[in-house]
Amino acid sequence: EEELQVIQPDKSISVAAGESATLHCTVTSLIPVGPIQWFRGAGPGRELIYNQKEGHFPRVTTVSDLTKRNNMDFSIRISNITPADAGTYYCVKFRKGSPDHVEFKSGAGTELSVRAKPSAPVVSGPAARATPQHTVSFTCESHGFSPRDITLKWFKNGNELSDFQTNVDPAGDSVSYSIHSTAKVVLTREDVHSQVICEVAHVTLQGDPLRGTANLSETIRVPPTLEVTQQPVRAENQVNVTCQVRKFYPQRLQLTWLENGNVSRTETASTLTENKDGTYNWMSWLLVNVSAHRDDVKLTCQVEHDGQPAVSKSHDLKVSAHPKEQGSNTAPGPALASAAPL
């Protein structure tokens, strides 16, 4: 009679974490008499996974009924597979012996690889806000995947980014892996509504990549532009001066009016108008009683935006005899002289 062969038909199998793995093994003869054992690995350090005759293996069940007299199928099913179960499994036939069974023949082995999905990518931006034209770094992290091969891409508003560095850890063998990537993004004034997206593709995701996003609204600070103008009013001894605060983000803003360097009024921006690009505008006005002033008046609009150092714009009111015209200051720099009604 032909000598018994141990047949493991699958050279390798791949199983998703959490599922069951079926390891196939058949023998070609009922002789010699003796048990089958399953091992993970080979050599003196191999690990017993299942012993037909003794032991308690709660995660292992046999596919066939081993008590049947002519059974030649010694396949096993391992439940609730985790990445730690990866390895090469050998089905080994033992010959009955005394006092111990003697190893008779081994199958060629089945390599079990475990697929584990990456966690949802988490994107984080810089701790402090930055202004347009500055370059900021975003990080993306995803963990717990197996096998190691993975693809990561960065996008800003649908446009793929190229300035990034990615590492998969550990460099050596592991039951599961992590990916860490850092992308550099140049901010523009239009980025309040922009998004940075980290996209991770892995064999376990069946072509449907995972995405993590960060809103640039949490990263960008657009400083305001200031314009101080003088408006005519009906009352001849009053001048209405407005301070237009334009195109700023975020909303947090405090404005102070100064008359000749002395604080006249402080207010916090409340009723803002939002621009299409996500920035805000705000206007504050100051009614100046010109008759109360003998000399020219320097009016300063001072704005503190998002805790940053104050920026200001000044406007000079010329206190002169019965002017007929009014002017406005629309240019930065030293205040322009403007006629004001007395």
Partner: antibody, heavy 122, light 112 residues
Framework: QVQLQESGPGLVKPSETLSLTCTVS????????WSWIRQPPGKGLEWIGF???????FYQSSLKSRVTISLDTSKNQFSLKMTSVTAADTAVYYC????????????????WGQGTTVTVSS | DIVMTQSPLSLPVTPGEPASISCRSS???????????LDWYLQRPGQSPQLLIY???SRASGVPDRFSGSGSGTDFTLKISRVEAEDVGVFYC?????????FGQGTKVEIK
Amino acid sequence: QVQLQESGPGLVKPSETLSLTCTVSGGSIRDYYWSWIRQPPGKGLEWIGFIYYNGRTFYQSSLKSRVTISLDTSKNQFSLKMTSVTAADTAVYYCARVRAYSGIGLDGTDVWGQGTTVTVSS
Amino acid sequence: DIVMTQSPLSLPVTPGEPASISCRSSQSLLYSTGYTYLDWYLQRPGQSPQLLIYGGSSRASGVPDRFSGSGSGTDFTLKISRVEAEDVGVFYCGQALQTPLTFGQGTKVEIK
């Protein structure tokens, strides 16, 4: 292909601890045994011990009390620590990969590092 | 421990001629599965050992076919069909059936 590179001090004082690291590049730690073998000057090969990828260790009985082999799969490295060294531990130390295909035995030490000379002297 | 004994310890050879080295183990290296856990290594001068033969008779990858291994149980032979100048060095047999792994004392092959 797989390459092994030993690193560590070339000179160790008597009674101190010898520490060597072997870095595995170009291949996987899994399914292999990772061995340390030494060769005293002008003599033959002496097996010190090995570690399997699952962390199980095996040592030369005469060295067992002084030797620890450990594995860091995340760095693709394994290490040898030998305490209380004497002049008799002066040797070229090799790290090597041992294959295991099936069964209880092993299938040859198929990849060797270039060896690092360790001298025990005060 | 399994003791490995080689002979001869020194072997002068002539290039182009055959050569043979013997190795004996203190217990059988033929396992119950029919596999022989005996390996042969060559250590060229100033180099690390390299695996020539494993499993008693299987040539390792890249090893020229002039090297062959034979034997079973406790007696083994390494044959070089036609010695070449690059074959000089020390040949070791080693057993891989059980720990500790053990090696023969080595056979030094040199050109006459």
